[in-house]
């Protein structure tokens, strides 16, 4: 999945949010996994949905939820407590540069990976940005190659910090360029970890 | 140590599994170092090996291994405990372009830090890929340039994820290019904590 | 940066997030602390505002965070950078931008570099660009310690909660 | 808005070396490359090259390795080139300038002569 | 290296005249993957260090009258001053910064009759 058009970056990532984001209440319902006991810890793998979206493994390969942790990828991820959390997210990329010369700002591509809140205490309105990375890209040409795209370029966009949640606040991944996600293992992933 | 030679990529990077990695069972052993009590945690510091390769240092500077902790270079980080741990690793690259024009899929370099787990209750077969980062850099030549290489480019390479890790498993840190890795102070590392 | 910036949510900057009232046992030290946005030419963390806080210990002293008691503690930290198309004028060399995360201790007469990473970008040959750093560790740290970060590029800094932050937790 | 402010002429012996210096006020100047020029009367402009204060990274005209040595202190903002082995050759006008901001500072006149 | 070649080396013109010099490269200037002309025009005031008034070939760098215009592309630049005054007294530089080392043309000496 080599990509080379460049999607138009969202101008309000949280409204995207994770392809139609709603903040109603999950039910109280056992979490999908308990695989440690201890603190509500939760780590994500990037998994491609339909439409060239970004959706998120909660059982496969390292994927987990403990303690009561709860996701879905309409919803995001649900913790089980008020607390402070060390929420991380990396998002590897990868395109080509399009055929042909041209406007380098039209190769240029910002790739935007950016965590969000909703929800629970802090309310139903808008989507709080927490942290995020950004990196842009600006493939090389070859000035002689006019045909077919350019070499195939990665990157990841990564970042991690404490954010002190409520029970029932959710929180999700945004990205601008859904398109241009590199699901190979272990490049594409989100987490929490409760730590005080 | 400015490189400009470009080390061909390994395909397979479990197969170059850190410099021939051996699954074989450590000897019960006190731990190389117990500064402090409590989880289990280590921070190890890149160091460079004989021939180009990247090796780790256990005790100089901020490098620790805590709480029963085991680590060689020809076998990885050992943990002592069926748990939840937080890895990390940051790999710093520098290089220089190569000299004179040409194609520019011949300038660009991928350089891949990957965190890999192998041995224990996992089994001895293959090295099983937890976390990656990757960054494609084209260094940006000096057209006019024939001689000499050109500037120098700087980049890092991190990732941090939780994993559920078993007694007696080991990680390991693979990358793509040995030869690039930055040594500078702070750069280059790699590290685990127990979190539950 | 119009264009390029990150820009901060509508929620973030109309409201604050509820205080935690955790109860004192389940407190460990920890800090977040965020680049103050006012400071366009030096980058000054604040605490207590937006999501940044101080807890159990924790506190900030001439822009370094003092470490309360020692221990294993994850530090981490975030700079974003970004720039305008051609906002050099008459070169073409690279910018150089760098972030690290410093150490001062009574056991060092000097300032140790514990994270750090370095980026060479090319604002001559590229559009508006966004950079991002980011690194994290865990490091045994004393009482007393300072952690403190240096950074070059300071103008081309995002200044926003989520983009520019500091932070450490005991473990 | 900022400044290049350079060290005062200096007048030295042939064999001896010199030392320039060019300190910016009114930013931070580690990320941006400080590079020299030489103008001597009826000469015009010469490069002689450029540092990274940030990261000491160097490019020098080849016609002036050897002979011009760049340095710099982030802590004091200010950037330093060392010419040595001074003969009448060297003797100039040097200027220090940043050209992704467009400064220059004010020059520094070198006389070399026994 | 790429050489920079300036005409006329010097000029008379009296106040209020129009001024064009030349600038020629040794190689294009022009940088394929932006479409930018790496080129800068200095002036040089009798006794002062040079200013900036061009970068980009044709960008005006902040504070520079609108008087004066650089043009051109490739090879081939000018910088144009539409109403010479008095105070434009100076030899006028262009300079590559496309590739290393950074080279300067040899100026033109801009007098006024």
């Known amino acids: 999945q080599d990509q080379g058009g460049l999607v138009t970056e969202t101008a309000d990532p949280g409204a995207q949010a994770q392809q139609g984001l709603g903040f109603q209440k999950l039910p109280e319902e056992e979490p999908e996994t308990d695989l440690s006991p201890g603190l509500p810890a939760a780590h994500l793998i990037g998994a491609p949905l339909k439409g060239q979206g970004l959706g998120w493994e909660t059982t496969k390969e390292q994927a987990f939820l403990t303690s009561g942790t709860q996701f879905s990828d309409a919803e995001g991820l649900a913790l089980p407590q008020d607390g402070l959390y060390y929420l991380y997210c990396l998002v590897g990329y990868r395109g080509r540069a399009p055929p042909g010369g041209g406007d380098p700002q039209g190769r240029s591509v910002t790739l935007r990976s950016s965590l969000y809140r909703a929800g629970g205490a802090y309310g139903p309105g808008t989507p709080e940005l927490l942290l995020e990375g950004a990196e842009t890209v600006t493939p090389v040409l070859d000035p002689a190659r006019r045909q077919g795209y350019g070499p195939l370029w990665y990157t990841s966009v990564g970042f991690g910090g404490l954010v002190q949640l409520r029970r029932g606040e959710r929180v999700y991944v945004n990205i601008s360029h859904p398109d241009m996600v590199d699901f190979a293992r272990g490049k594409t992933f989100f987490g929490a970890v409760m730590v005080g | 140590q400015d490189q400009g030679g470009l080390v061909t990529e390994t395909a397979d990077p479990g197969a170059q599994a850190q410099q021939g990695l051996g699954f074989q069972k450590l000897p019960e052993e006190e731990p190389e170092t117990d500064l402090s009590p409590g989880l289990p945690a280590a921070h190890l510091i890149g160091a460079p090996l004989k021939g180009q390769g990247l090796g780790w240092e256990t005790t100089k500077e901020q490098a620790f291994l805590t709480s029963g902790t085991q680590f060689s270079d020809a076998e990885g980080l050992a943990l002592p405990q069926d748990g939840l741990y937080y890895l990390y690793c940051l790999v710093g690259y520098r290089g220089r372009a190569p000299p004179g024009g040409g194609d520019p899929q011949g300038r660009s370099v991928t350089l891949r830090s990957s965190l890999y787990r192998a041995g224990g209750a996992y089994g001895p077969g293959t090295p099983e890929l937890l976390l990656e980062g990757a960054e494609t850099v084209t260094p940006v030549l000096d057209p006019a340039r024939r001689q000499g290489y050109g500037p120098l480019w700087y980049t890092s390479v991190g990732f941090g994820g939780l994993v559920q890790l078993r007694r007696g498993e080991r990680v390991y840190v693979n990358i793509s290019h040995p030869d690039m890795v930055d040594f500078a102070r702070g750069k280059t590392f790699f590290g685990a904590v127990m979190v539950g | 940066l119009p264009g390029v910036g990150l820009t901060p949510s509508a929620a973030q900057t109309a409201r604050q997030h509820p205080k935690m009232h955790l109860a004192h046992s389940t407190l460990k030290p920890a800090a977040h602390l965020i680049g103050d946005p006012s400071k366009q030419n030096s980058l000054l963390w604040r605490a207590n505002t937006d999501r940044a806080f101080l807890q159990d210990g924790f506190s900030l002293s001439n822009n370094s965070l003092l470490v309360p008691t020692s221990g294993i503690y994850f530090v981490y930290s975030q700079v974003v950078f970004s720039g305008k198309a051609y906002s050099p004028k008459a070169t073409s060399s690279p910018l150089y931008l760098a972030h690290e995360v410093q150490l001062f201790s009574s056991q060092y007469p000097f300032h140790v570099p514990l994270l750090s990473s370095q980026k060479m970008v090319y604002p001559g040959l590229q559009e508006p660009w966004l950079h991002s750093m980011y690194h994290g560790a865990a490091f045994q740290l004393t009482q007393g310690d300072q952690l403190s970060t240096h950074t070059d590029g300071i103008p081309h800094l995002v200044l926003s909660p989520s983009t520019v932050f500091f932070g450490a937790f005991a473990l | 808005q900022g400044q290049l402010q350079q060290s005062g002429a200096e007048l030295m012996k042939p064999g001896a070396s010199v030392k320039i210096s060019c300190k910016a006020t009114g930013y931070t100047f580690s990320s941006y490359w400080i590079e020299w020029v030489k103008q001597r009367p009826g000469h015009g402009l010469e490069w002689i090259g450029e540092i990274s204060p940030g990261s000491g990274s160097t490019n020098y005209n080849e016609e002036f390795k050897g002979k011009a040595t760049f340095t710099a202190d982030k802590s004091s903002n200010t950037a330093y080139i060392q010419l040595s082995s001074l003969t009448s050759e060297d003797s100039a006008v040097y200027y220090c300038?940043?050209?992704?901001?467009?400064?220059w500072g004010q020059g520094t006149t070198l006389t070399v002569s026994s | 290296d790429i050489v920079m070649s300036q005409s006329p080396s010097s000029l008379a013109v009296s106040v209020g005249e129009k001024v064009t010099m030349s600038c020629k490269s040794s190689q294009s200037l022009l940088y394929s993957t932006n479409q930018k002309n790496f080129l800068a025009w200095y002036q040089q005031k009798p006794g002062q260090s040079p200013k900036l008034l061009i970068y980009w070939a044709s960008t005006r760098d902040s504070g520079v009258p609108d008087r004066f215009t650089g043009s051109g592309s490739g090879t081939d630049f000018t910088l144009t001053i539409s109403s010479v005054k008095a105070e434009d007294l100076a030899v006028y530089y262009c300079q590559q910064y496309y590739s290393y080392p950074r080279t300067f043309g040899g100026g033109t000496k801009l007098e006024i009759k």
């Open positions: 300038a940043d050209g992704y901001h467009g400064y």
